[in-house]
C-alpha cells in the first residue's frame, strides 16, 4: 500500500464517534449486550471485513504507515455501505426518512468519502437479496449486520481517536 496523504484525523474521529452512536441508535439491544463475539472459522473470516493484528491499526503500525490500516477501514465501510444499500434494508419493514438508519447510511458515506483517495477504484459486489421464501430473515439479517457494524465502528473509532491524538501534524505558525 503506497504512502499517501494522511486523512484529517480529527474529522475522522468526530465522524466515526458519531457513527458509533448512530449504529447503536439504529439497533439498541433489548437487554445488556457485549459487542459481537467473533467466532473464527474460515467461513466467517472470509465473509466479514475485520480489523485484525496484521492490518497495522495498532499504535506502532499507524505511526509506521497508516495507509495499511486506513485501507482496511475503507474496505469495511464499503462492505457495510453495500449491505445497507441492499434489499435487506430497502424492503419491509420500510425505513423512515431521517430515521437513525438513514442518518447512519449518510454518515457512513461521509466517512467513506473522507477516506477515499480520488483515484481509488470502486469495488463491485453483488447486491444481496432475499427470495420470497426468505422474507422472514430480513429483520434477523438487519440485526446481524448492525451488530457486526457496531463492533467494526467501535474499533475504527479507537483508531481515529489515536490518530487524532498522536498523528495530527501541528499547525506551524506563519510569521
Amino acid at each position: 500500500v503506497p504512502r499517501s496523504s494522511s486523512p484529517d484525523w480529527a474529522q475522522c474521529q468526530q465522524l466515526s464517534r458519531n457513527l458509533c452512536m448512530l449504529a447503536w441508535n439504529a439497533h439498541a439491544p433489548a437487554g445488556h449486550m457485549n459487542l459481537l463475539r467473533e467466532e473464527e472459522d474460515e467461513e466467517t473470516k472470509n465473509n466479514v471485513p475485520r480489523i485484525q493484528c496484521e492490518d497495522g491499526c495498532d499504535p506502532q503500525g499507524l505511526k509506521d504507515n497508516s495507509q495499511f490500516c486506513l485501507q482496511r477501514i475503507r474496505q469495511g465501510l464499503a462492505f457495510y455501505k453495500h449491505l445497507l444499500d441492499s434489499d435487506i434494508f430497502k424492503g419491509e419493514p420500510a425505513l423512515l426518512p431521517d430515521s437513525p438508519m438513514e442518518q447512519l447510511h449518510t454518515s457512513l458515506l461521509g466517512l467513506s468519502q473522507l477516506l477515499q483517495p480520488e483515484d481509488h477504484p470502486r469495488e463491485t459486489q453483488q447486491m444481496p437479496s432475499l427470495s420470497s421464501s426468505q422474507q422472514w430473515q430480513r429483520p434477523l439479517l438487519r440485526s446481524k449486520i448492525l451488530r457486526s457494524l457496531q463492533a467494526f465502528l467501535a474499533i475504527a473509532a479507537r483508531v481515529f481517536a489515536h490518530g487524532a491524538a498522536t498523528l495530527t501534524e501541528p499547525l506551524v505558525p506563519t510569521a
Epitope: R37, E39, L141, K144
Partner: nanobody
Framework: EVQLVESGGGLVQAGGSLRLSCAAS????????MGWFRQAPGKEREFVAA????????YYADSVKGRFTISRDNAKNTVYLQMNSLKPEDTAVYYC??????????????WGQGTQVTVSS
C-alpha cells in the same frame, strides 16, 4: 456443534396454552440466534420466532405476533416458546434451531428432533 432437545408439546383445546422448551448443549457459547420453526402436515417448514442469545432481541412471524412469546434463560441454556390463544392452524411439529454464525447470513444449521403440538377445535 450445538445439540438441541425440545419438550412441552401435546394436545390442547383451541384457545388454550402450551409452553415449549428447548435445551441446548455443546458449543452454546457460539449461539447467535435460537429460533422456533414449525411444519404442518403437507406444508413447508415455516419460521415462528427467534431470539438473540446475547441481548434478547425477539422476532416473530406475523401469524403468531401477540399470541406467542419467545424467551431464554442463558444460565440454563434453554429457550422457551409460550403459546397462548392457540388455534387449530397452529397444529404442527415444532422444531428448535440454532444459528451459530456471526457472518452476514441467517443459517439455522443445528436442529432438534421436534415436538408435536396438536390443537383441537
Amino acid at each position: 456443534e450445538v445439540q438441541l432437545v425440545e419438550s412441552g408439546g401435546g394436545l390442547v383445546q383451541a384457545g388454550g396454552s402450551l409452553r415449549l422448551s428447548c435445551a441446548a448443549s455443546g458449543r452454546t457459547f457460539s449461539i447467535y440466534y435460537m429460533g422456533w420453526f414449525r411444519q404442518a402436515p403437507g406444508k413447508e417448514r415455516e419460521f415462528v420466532a427467534a431470539i438473540t442469545w446475547i441481548g434478547g432481541d425477539t422476532y416473530y412471524a406475523d401469524s403468531v405476533k401477540g399470541r406467542f412469546t419467545i424467551s431464554r434463560d442463558n444460565a440454563k441454556n434453554t429457550v422457551y416458546l409460550q403459546m397462548n390463544s392457540l388455534k387449530p392452524e397452529d397444529t404442527a411439529v415444532y422444531y428448535c434451531a440454532v444459528d451459530d454464525r456471526t457472518n452476514m447470513s441467517v443459517d439455522f444449521g443445528s436442529w432438534g428432533q421436534g415436538t408435536q403440538v396438536t390443537v383441537s377445535s
